[in-house]
Structure formats: structure tokens, C-alpha cells
Interface confidence: low
């Protein structure tokens, strides 16, 4: 059946999703809302104005915020079961050219596994072009470059992150499809570990080449808020983070990788029902600007600054933050106009400290993630082999050959 690359292009009614959780508190038009009560003890990314560093802290109940549907990086729209568009957003994997569809036999027959897949196109996630992702059996896609033990913590696209066990039933499959303009992962007839009697779940996440993300839900046999998170986090939404390499006090020549979640959209789990869908449309980010003039004159909700030495526009809060800091971009941009840079040679600079994206320990332990709110430890494993699925393996040699323990 022929592919359906154009699914979900039309506009629809406004969203009913309520976003919770991490937002950039210093640059966000969040509104206080006494009428909407969010979960207590949810994490909030805040700026430590004293030392200029970032830390995860917890908002007390009386400061709970509900963020409007414009989430700075994305606009989300909910389509309920009665909306025709919810059906249109479902990508018909059965219609795809068979060469573009893979039933991932390993993920379809195991529990708490993840496997790296290479996309046929650059997918812009929070403004970052990504070429490889990691599909997990637990109803989410890990979007990070570096595999670590806390996959479920951040850098995810999660239509329904939960303790799914595709190995429970022969009917359960994890299918993915890539036609060059859309990449779809479908968790098909998967069961919740320990809740098999509730029935099977069928849902999908679609990553469109233009940056749109669609969650479509076909079969959701139970109320999502009732799903237990004691063994595995239960989340629906998006998250991204940056990594900072810190000198390790124990081994001075090594650097410890710390992960900081800079943005999260958590969807109201009660809205996840059979035949509903949600579409995330990306908003412009600083990263898209390729010149100083465009950067400095941009009318975004972000405070965009131009770093001449990197020839990059940034708010300072994206995956390139390490470079932004290493090259002194934050200081360089202060009070300067584009004409100030015109006579400077941007090729001669060097960073304050040497930086390689694969410095440090790839199997980062939970203690080196400054995310205090995590309560459960997962034993999701990455399958580093291509096996019989024709999957390309782009893992660092350090991780090749043995499964890497991953976690919440």
C-alpha cells in the first residue's frame, strides 16, 4: 500500500494539552493558573543567578505553573477521537513500500531494549539536525547522541513511555518506516508488563522532515493516568538537554559528563485515548539564523546572541552549549553589535578548553546526571548489533560489543 508522507499537513482546532514540567524559567511567558493544578514536586529547570550554573530544583506546590500550548520550541495541537484529523495523522505503515518498513525483530521480542537506527534525512529536533535516533521498547524514542543509563530522563520523543514488553506476545511488534520525508515508529499491539490483562496498546510517533512530530494513538485500552510508574517512568511528551563536561575531582585529567534538561513538554496523560492524536509544530529557534544580522534582529521569544568565532546564533541553551561556553561566546556577545565583528577573523580562535563530543565516560552513571527528581532505575539495554534487521550501527567503539545499561 503506497506511502502516506503527507499525513497531517492540514491545520486543525486548538490544542487541549496542558504542558507541565521543565521550561526555561527566565525567558518563558508562563502564566500562573490557580484553575489548573499540576503534580506536586515536578521538576523545574532554573537559573542559578549567583554562580551562573544550572541546577534542577523542585517547585513547591504553591508555585505550580501551567504553560500555554505555545511551548517556546513547539506548538502542540490535540485532536480528540471525534476529530477527523486524528485519523489523518495516523501514518498508514501498511501502505508503505515494503522496502521502507522494518519490523524490528529484536525489539519486537524483548523487554527494556533499545536499538539505534539511522534516519534517511536530517530531522530537526529543538532546532538540532539529527541523523540517528534510538528506538526503545518502552514507547519512546531517545534522541540523544550519547547512550547512558538514564535514557528515559530526557532527550526523548515519547508518545507513551511506559513499561511495555513486546516480548510478551507474538502479536506485539515494533515497526518503523522511513520514506525519506517521514520516519515513523509504531508500537503495535504491545502489552504493559504486569498489566497484560488490560489489553494491547497500538500507537506511533512520526518524525517529519520539516520538524513536525506527531503522536497518534490507535488502541489505548486503559486510562493512562492509572498506569503505574513504579517500575518504569510513564511520560508523554518531548524533552531535550545539553551535556556539559566537568573536570572530575577524582581523576583530574578526565571529564565528567553532566546532563541538563533545558526544556520539556509533558502532555496531560488523561488526553491520551484511543484514536486521539497530537501534533507538535516546531517554532523558530536561534539556531536557524545563519548570519549576525538575522540573529540579532530576530523577534523570537529567545534572547538570541551571535557568536562570531563559531558563526553561530544561540540563546546559549541548546545542545551546543559546551562549545558556547568553551569559546567564550557568552562573554563575546555582551554589548556587541554585528558591525563590531566585521573586521575580525573567526577562524583563528581556539576554545578555552579542548572539547570532544566523546570525551568522558560513555556509560554515564546516574550520579553524574544532575536530575534530582528521578525515582526509578530502568534496566533498558541497548542492542549494539545490526543483527538481521539491517540496522546501521553508529555507536562509539567504546559501546560496541556489550550491551550498555541504560536507565530512567
Amino acid at each position: 500500500l503506497s506511502p502516506q508522507p503527507g499525513a497531517g499537513h492540514d491545520e486543525g482546532p486548538g490544542s487541549g494539552w496542558a504542558a507541565k514540567g521543565t521550561v526555561r524559567g527566565w525567558n518563558r511567558r508562563a502564566r500562573e493558573s490557580p484553575g489548573h493544578v499540576s503534580e506536586p514536586d515536578r521538576t523545574q529547570l532554573s537559573q542559578d543567578l549567583g554562580g551562573g550554573t544550572l541546577a534542577m530544583d523542585t517547585l513547591p506546590d504553591n508555585r505550580t505553573r501551567v504553560v500555554e500550548d505555545n511551548h517556546s520550541y513547539y506548538v502542540s495541537r490535540l485532536y480528540g477521537p471525534s476529530e477527523p484529523h486524528s485519523r489523518e495523522l495516523w501514518v498508514d505503515v501498511a501502505e508503505a513500500n515494503r522496502s521502507q518498513v522494518k519490523i524490528h525483530t529484536i525489539l519486537s521480542n524483548t523487554h527494556r531494549q533499545a536499538s539505534r537506527v539511522v534516519l534517511s534525512f536530517d530531522f530537526p529536533f529543538y532546532g538540532h539536525p539529527l541523523r540517528q535516533i534510538t528506538i526503545a521498547t518502552g514507547g519512546f524514542i531517545f534522541m540523544g547522541d550519547v547512550i547512558h543509563r538514564m535514557l528515559t530522563a530526557t532527550q526523548y520523543v515519547a508518545p507513551l513511555m511506559a513499561n511495555f514488553n513486546p516480548g510478551y506476545s507474538d502479536n506485539s511488534t515494533v515497526v518503523y518506516f522511513d520514506n525519506g520525508t517521514v520516519f515513523v515508529v509504531q508500537w503495535d499491539h504491545v502489552y504493559l508488563q504486569g498489566w497484560e490483562d488490560k489489553g494491547s496498546f497500538t500507537f506511533q510517533a512520526a518524525l517529519h522532515h520539516d520538524g513536525r512530530i506527531v503522536f497518534a494513538y490507535k488502541e489505548i485500552p486503559m486510562s493512562v493516568p492509572e498506569i503505574s510508574s513504579s517500575q518504569h517512568p510513564v511520560k508523554t511528551g518531548l524533552s531535550d538537554a545539553f551535556m556539559i563536561l566537568n573536570p572530575s575531582p577524582d581523576v583530574p585529567e578526565s571529564r565528567r559528563r553532566s546532563i541538563f534538561e533545558y526544556h520539556r513538554i509533558e502532555l496531560d496523560p488523561s488526553k491520551v485515548t484511543s484514536m486521539s492524536a497530537v501534533e507538535f509544530t516546531p517554532l523558530p529557534t536561534c539556531l536557524q539564523h545563519r548570519s549576525c544580522d538575522a540573529c540579532m534582529s530576530s523577534d523570537l521569544t529567545f534572547n538570541c546572541s551571535w557568536c562570531h568565532v563559531l558563526q553561530r546564533c544561540s540563546s546559549g541553551f541548546d545542545r551546543y552549549r559546551q562549545e558556547w561556553m568553551d569559546y567564550g561566546c557568552a562573554q563575546e556577545a555582551e554589548g556587541r553589535m554585528c558591525e563590531d565583528f566585521q573586521d575580525e577573523d573567526h577562524d583563528s580562535a581556539s576554545p578555552d578548553t579542548s572539547f570532544s563530543p566523546y570525551d568522558g565516560d560513555l556509560t554515564t552513571t546516574s550520579s553524574s546526571l544532575f536530575i534530582d527528581s528521578l525515582t526509578t532505575e530502568d534496566d533498558t539495554k541497548l542492542n549494539p548489533y545490526a543483527g538481521g534487521d539491517g540496522l546501521q550501527n553508529n555507536l562509539s567503539p567504546k559501546t560496541k560489543g556489550t550491551p550498555v545499561h541504560l536507565g530512567t
Partner: antibody, heavy 120, light 107 residues
Framework: EVQLLESGGGLVQPGGSLRLSCAAS????????MSWVRQAPGKGLEWVSS????????YYADSVKGRFTISRDNSKNTLYLQMNSLRAEDTAVYYC?????????????WGQGTLVTVSS | DIQMTQSPSSLSASVGDRVTITCRAS??????LNWYQQKPGKAPKLLIY???SLQSGVPSRFSGSGSGTDFTLTISSLQPEDLATYYC?????????FGQGTKVEIK
């Protein structure tokens, strides 16, 4: 209860036209794809055409391509099949079927059918 | 087009018998196979989708199995009301195609 009720069948001469209708009830019509499947007398089933929920996507069997047009009016919960340039081999009972176009594209509910006879 | 071939074309069995109908695809179709029952003078009814998933409301005596090119519909204990013609259908690629049908009669 899902119900599909076809109408519009009858006797028509070769080269003639006919428009079939299928009135749907018992489900949210606009959220489902719909299909036409036909069955010649004493023969098996043959898929004819499908249309997605919004009407934006249509598909046809080679045997009817260019002659038949599938359409829908979601405000009336009605599916249509406009049949032009009819041939003797188009004689069949025409069923409309609700189509689950998830992973397995199954026809999960069927109407009772309407007979189209093409004969001179 | 993918050809679907069913066998046998007809069979006769007694009430309580185990009945097996096979469907073969001209090329591998993974599990993209559905089964339908059509009683005399009636419209078809979906029994099994995705090769082995039982449609809601269908008696559990019906089951499906197989993947790739070879598929089986099994009626574990034939009942009088199972007198019908059974069709397989592939949804692996357009055009959607059906098998020629298997007529099941009661002895």
C-alpha cells in the same frame, strides 16, 4: 451499532453510468477510511476503491481506474461510488466497507450490498 | 499484484471437527493478512486480522496463524453456523487482493 446501507444499484446498459451511495451510522464516519468491494455472481471478492477519512486520499483497482470515482460527504455520513463507462464485467454486488487503515488495513464492517447489473 | 491462493476450494466436515484452511501468497507479506467469513446471501464478516488477531465478537474457536507466505485459518470445533465461504485478504501492497475462497459445508 455500526450500520452501512448501500443504495443506487440497478440495471444499466454498457457504457452507461450509475452512482452508488452508502449511508453510515453508529460510528464517527469522518474518522474512518471507507472502501468499496464487489462480488460478481458466484465469484469471489474484489477490492474496488478506498478513500481516507477526510476524502483527501483515494485509491483504485486497475480494473476501474479512470472510470470509477470514490467520494464521501462527511456532513451526511455518506460514501459514494460514481461509476462511468460501465462494462458487463462490472456486474456484481457492491459492498461498502468500513476500513481500519492502521497497520493491517482490514475491512471491519460491511453493508448488505447493492446489485449492479450491466447488460444490454 | 500479489496473488492469494486458498486451499482447499471446498471442504465438508462434521460438527465438532477441527477444520483448517490455508492461504498462500505469491510473495512474502509478513503478517499483513486478514480472514473473512461470508455466509450464503450475506455480506462478509471480519474474523481475523494481522494473521492471528481475533476480531472483537468473533468466537474463540476461530484462530489464525502464519507469516511470510503461508497462513492458516483454523476452526477448532466446527459448528453448524460456520457453514460459509472463507476468504483471505492481503494488505501488504496495493491493490488489496483476496483469495478465491474456501467453501465449508457441514456433513
Amino acid at each position: 451499532e455500526v450500520q452501512l446501507l448501500e443504495s443506487g444499484g440497478g440495471l444499466v446498459q454498457p457504457g452507461g453510468s450509475l452512482r452508488l451511495s452508502c449511508a453510515a451510522s453508529g460510528f464517527t464516519f469522518s474518522t474512518y477510511a471507507m472502501s468499496w468491494v464487489r462480488q460478481a455472481p458466484g465469484k469471489g471478492l474484489e477490492w474496488v476503491s478506498s478513500i481516507y477519512g477526510s476524502g483527501g486520499k483515494t485509491y483504485y483497482a486497475d480494473s476501474v481506474k479512470g472510470r470509477f470515482t470514490i467520494s464521501r460527504d462527511n456532513s451526511k455520513n455518506t460514501l459514494y461510488l460514481q461509476m462511468n463507462s460501465l462494462r458487463a464485467e462490472d456486474t456484481a454486488v457492491y459492498y461498502c466497507a468500513r476500513t481500519d487503515y492502521s497497520l493491517y488495513y482490514q475491512f471491519d464492517y460491511w453493508g448488505q450490498g447493492t446489485l449492479v447489473t450491466v447488460s444490454s | 499484484d500479489i496473488q492469494m491462493t486458498q486451499s482447499p476450494s471446498s471442504l465438508s466436515a462434521s460438527v465438532g471437527d477441527r477444520v483448517t484452511i490455508t492461504c498462500r501468497a505469491s510473495q512474502s507479506i509478513s503478517r499483513y493478512l486478514n480472514w473473512y467469513q461470508q455466509k450464503p446471501g450475506k455480506a462478509p464478516k471480519l474474523l481475523i486480522y494481522a494473521a492471528s488477531s481475533l476480531q472483537s465478537g468473533v468466537p474463540s474457536r476461530f484462530s489464525g496463524s502464519g507469516s511470510g507466505t503461508d497462513f492458516t485459518l483454523t476452526i477448532s470445533s466446527l459448528q453448524p453456523e460456520d457453514l460459509a465461504t472463507y476468504y483471505c485478504q492481503q494488505s501488504y501492497s496495493y491493490p488489496v487482493t483476496f483469495g478465491q475462497g474456501t467453501k465449508v459445508e457441514i456433513k
